[in-house]
């Protein structure tokens, strides 16, 4: 004969435990139903009545099966340097990620707590390592034979043009200037185009450069003074 199915609430067998999606209520000393995502326990169970669940109120949620008296509060609205990639619903918290041209300087379990603007490499310096969702751009001095004349978080050091007759020789921050005859481009070692960093989130697949007026590393929360990284812009 099949074992009889127990309906909540029920007393567990001596030494036994409650089933999946049930919890043991210490006061009632019974196995009782948990509440599904999007709900919470409005009335806890007794020896004769099961848990009464109720929907989460606005701006609150539960993502997991639970027996909590109140739903969890959704995080605060996304800041101006962030994009809301997941809205606050009864079953999930709001998720904020950094907008293009910014990276996550202080992450949380999901999304980002604090975004910072990607470092811009100043003229004479190029991008050695592009920024990602969670790491800043790394700048490096342009090697002999290469230059960068921009302040950019994406531009690498490019090779000087090769002139038949040089009018002005190139340096780290300026291309060579040739006389009127047609120049040719050299391919300096390591002169590979680095693409703009692309976020793993689909919303970020078309990044746009950040405003050029912003400082190199602009945190939205006050931070202690620190010298600008080599090759990055700073006051």
């Amino acid at each position: 004969l099949p074992a009889q199915v127990a309906f909540t609430p029920y007393a567990p067998e001596p030494g036994g435990t409650c089933r999946l999606r049930e919890y043991y209520d210490q006061t009632a000393q019974m196995c009782c139903s948990k509440c599904p995502p999007g709900q919470h326990a409005k009335v806890f169970c007794t020896k004769t009545s099961d848990t009464v669940c109720d929907s989460c109120e606005d701006s609150t949620y539960t993502q997991l099966w639970n027996w909590v008296p109140e739903c969890l509060s959704c995080g605060s609205r996304c800041s101006s340097d962030q994009v809301e990639t997941q809205a606050c619903t009864r079953e999930q918290n709001r998720i904020c990620t950094c907008r293009p041209g910014w990276y996550c300087a202080l992450s949380k379990q999901e999304g980002c707590r604090l975004c910072a603007q990607l470092r811009k490499c100043r003229p004479g310096f190029g991008v050695a390592r592009p920024g990602t969702e969670t790491s800043d751009v790394v700048c490096k001095p342009c090697a002999p034979g290469t230059f960068s004349n921009t302040t950019s978080s994406t531009d690498i050091c490019r090779p000087h043009q090769i002139c038949h007759v040089v009018a002005i020789p190139g340096n780290a921050s300026m291309d060579a200037v040739c006389t009127s005859t047609s120049p040719t481009r050299s391919m300096a070692p390591g002169a590979v185009h680095l693409p703009q960093p692309v976020s793993t989130r689909s919303q970020h697949t078309q990044p746009t450069p950040a405003p050029s007026t912003a400082p190199g590393t602009s945190f939205l929360l006050p931070v202690g003074p620190s010298p600008p990284a080599e090759g990055s812009t700073g006051d």
Partner: antibody, heavy 128, light 112 residues
Framework: QSLEESGGDLVQPGASLTLTCTAS?????????MCWVRQAPGKGLELIAC?????????WYGSWAKGRFTISKSTNLNTVTLQMTSLTAADTATYFC????????????????????WGPGTLVTVSS | DIVMTQTPASVEAAVGGTVTIKCQAS???????LSWYQQKPGQRPKLLIY???TLASGVPSRFKGSGSGTEFTLTISDLECADAATYYC?????????????FGGGTEVVVK
């Protein structure tokens, strides 16, 4: 329903020690939520670790306690133990075990509130 | 983590008087997760109040708990000599990556 701690001792810095909490009048193996709390001489209460002794078996540690302290249950002995390693003078305290009379749960996480009963405590002294 | 801050650290009052102890949570918590304990020197803590305002069994009605969000209060009226003790609050909350639980620093009540 009562609890009693044992295993407190005078030990040298760097030593390890295991404390035991024995329950009477109820089974810790049936869905109890048991915690260890300590109190340094003349100081306040500090929550160390908790264990859901039911099917979940989830554990909780104070952020400062992760790594050096391990809470576990012994099904056949009706006990909960606290293993402590790399002890220092700062660990000198009376160690209490307590049972939460209310629990609340979110996924695998369990919150134990309203500790009752408490054991009388066991003294751990770390000194050279 | 959560920090429970109790004020004052110590308070003195006369027999028959009233004492108010405040407990502030570092972030908003459900009143369901707030408890108060009494501890006398050399003894184990004793549960006084749970769910912010519910008296534990055998606790006289002179003890009253109240509050919500981040501010909770324990009020002891008609003070008796036996109320001389240290009182602790305990509270916590859930998040998607865990559960947080802590005691306050304690308030010593001296009865004159």
């Amino acid at each position: 329903q009562s609890l009693e701690e044992s295993g407190g001792d005078l030990v040298q810095p760097g030593a390890s020690l295991t404390l035991t909490c024995t329950a009477s009048g109820f089974s810790v193996n049936v869905n109890s939520y048991m915690c260890w709390v300590r109190q340094a001489p003349g100081k306040g209460l500090e929550l160390i670790a908790c264990i859901d002794t039911g099917s979940g078996g989830s554990t909780w540690y104070g952020s400062w306690a992760k790594g050096r302290f391990t809470i576990s249950k012994s099904t056949n002995l009706n006990t909960v133990t606290l293993q402590m390693t790399s002890l220092t003078a700062a660990d000198t305290a009376t160690y209490f075990c307590a049972r939460a009379r209310n629990t609340y749960g979110y996924g695998d996480y369990v919150y134990g509130g309203a500790f009752d009963p408490w054991g009388p405590g066991t003294l751990v002294t770390v000194s050279s | 983590d959560i920090v429970m801050t109790q004020t004052p650290a110590s308070v003195e009052a006369a027999v028959g008087g009233t004492v108010t102890i405040k407990c502030q949570a570092s972030q908003s918590i459900s009143s369901t997760y707030l408890s108060w304990y009494q501890q006398k020197p050399g003894q184990r803590p004793k549960l006084l109040i749970y769910q912010a305002s519910t008296l534990a069994s055998g606790v006289p009605s002179r003890f009253k708990g109240s509050g919500s969000g981040t501010e909770f209060t324990l009020t002891i009226s008609d003070l008796e000599c036996a109320d001389a003790a240290t009182y602790y609050c305990q509270g916590g909350y859930f998040s998607d990556n865990g559960c947080y639980n802590a005691f306050g620093g304690g308030t010593e009540v001296v009865v004159k």
